[in-house]
């Protein structure tokens, strides 16, 4: 039986590979029973968490992995030196900076190891799941009377990620959003003097290096303009 | 914040040398690919050389024998060497840097306006 996974992170040829013994048609044995998917996340490429859901299994189970990078220069099979735990039982495994190799197809491995049988197999694209961090140093400075230039920072080569701007005034209720590219600048041509303004970014790790789905977090907040509190019922809301 | 700054540009004759130096801040340098592009007027940019963070270096054909990449980790800067130099290497020269095993695994067109502001080098015969 080989099933292939549709995961939620953009790598559509993630198979996975369960491996059946031999059995009554009537009975189902251990080794049968599918194994978590496992989920793995790059941080801003300083390390990898990949991680699985452990309450899924019908007994508490460590669970081990094991990973290699497919025909590439380290395609040996490495035993995870890390594990991550929820409630005392293997949940995950982090992989340090040195052990990413973005560019190269990472294949990850999920067994039990009291039934060696039952294990699954997937290949990931390690580029697709970069998460940087958020944007820093947020900073705002006026171009012109009615015109703001918004500026921010980001841990990891510029070229490499895409931002989506998110700003709103006291009065509105709901945010408008503008994508960015690289150059991480953005302007908003007309702004209104009497009104208070709430700028926020989130950055991804596409298109130029890699192709990615998830946003990092979002920025902390930075505000322009004068605090109308006073007459807007919406602003609290706004903060909170 | 991250910055490639290009220096090292000028004018020379044909036959001569210069060595460009790009001096990189904001990111971890020793954990990257780093790179020269150029770009003549009216061109595309074009990949000149590349050297990976574990020392492995491409040249384009154009430049092989002629150029030479380098880097030093401690000074966070990489070099190119440029040897024997031809009119036709009159160009804007660029330092990119990308994310380890870019070069090696992936690849794609970039554009030279990614990165700094580039250094000129003018060639005349």
């Known amino acids: 039986l080989n099933t292939t996974i549709l995961t939620p992170n953009g790598n559509e040829d993630a198979t996975t590979d369960f491996f059946l013994t031999s059995m009554p048609t009537d009975s189902l044995s251990v080794s049968t029973l599918p194994l978590p998917e496992v989920q793995c996340f790059v941080f801003n490429v300083e390390y990898m968490n990949c991680t699985w859901n452990s309450s899924s299994e019908p007994q508490p189970t460590n669970l081990t992995l094991h990973y290699w990078y497919k025909n590439s220069d380290n395609d040996k099979v490495q035993k995870c030196s890390h594990y991550l735990f929820s409630e005392e039982i293997t949940s995950g495994c982090q992989l340090q900076k040195k052990e990413i190799h973005l560019y190269q197809t990472f294949v990850v491995q999920l067994q039990d190891p009291r039934e060696p049988r039952r294990q699954a197999t997937q290949m990931l694209k390690l580029q697709n799941l970069v998460i940087p961090w958020a944007p820093e140093n947020l900073t705002l400075r006026k171009l012109s009377e009615s015109q703001l230039e918004l500026n921010w920072n980001n841990r990891f080569l510029n070229h490499c990620l895409e931002h989506l701007v998110q700003y709103r005034t006291d009065w509105d209720h709901s945010w408008t959003e503008q994508s960015v590219d690289y150059r991480h600048k953005f302007s908003l041509p007309s702004v209104d003097g009497q009104k208070r303004y709430t700028f926020r970014v989130r950055s991804r790790f596409n298109p130029l290096c890699g192709s990615a789905q998830h946003w990092s977090e979002w920025s902390h907040p930075i505000h322009w303009g004068s605090n109308s509190s006073k007459e807007n019922p919406f602003l609290f809301a706004l903060e909170a | 914040q991250v910055q490639l700054q290009e220096s090292g540009g000028g004018s020379v004759q044909a036959g001569g040398s210069l060595r460009l130096s790009c001096t990189a801040s904001g990111f971890t340098f020793d954990d990257s690919d780093m790179g020269w592009y150029r770009q003549a007027p009216g061109n595309e940019c074009e990949l000149v050389s590349t050297?990976?963070?574990?020392?492995?270096?491409y040249y384009a054909d154009s430049v092989k024998g002629r150029f030479t990449i380098s880097q030093d980790n401690a000074k966070n800067t990489v070099y190119l060497q440029m040897n024997s130099l031809k009119p036709e290497d009159t160009a804007v020269y660029y330092c990119a840097a990308e994310p380890r095993g870019y070069y090696s695994n992936y690849g794609g067109r970039r554009e030279c306006n990614y990165w700094g502001q580039g250094t000129q080098v003018t060639v005349s015969s």
């Open positions: 050297i990976s963070s574990d020392g492995s270096t």
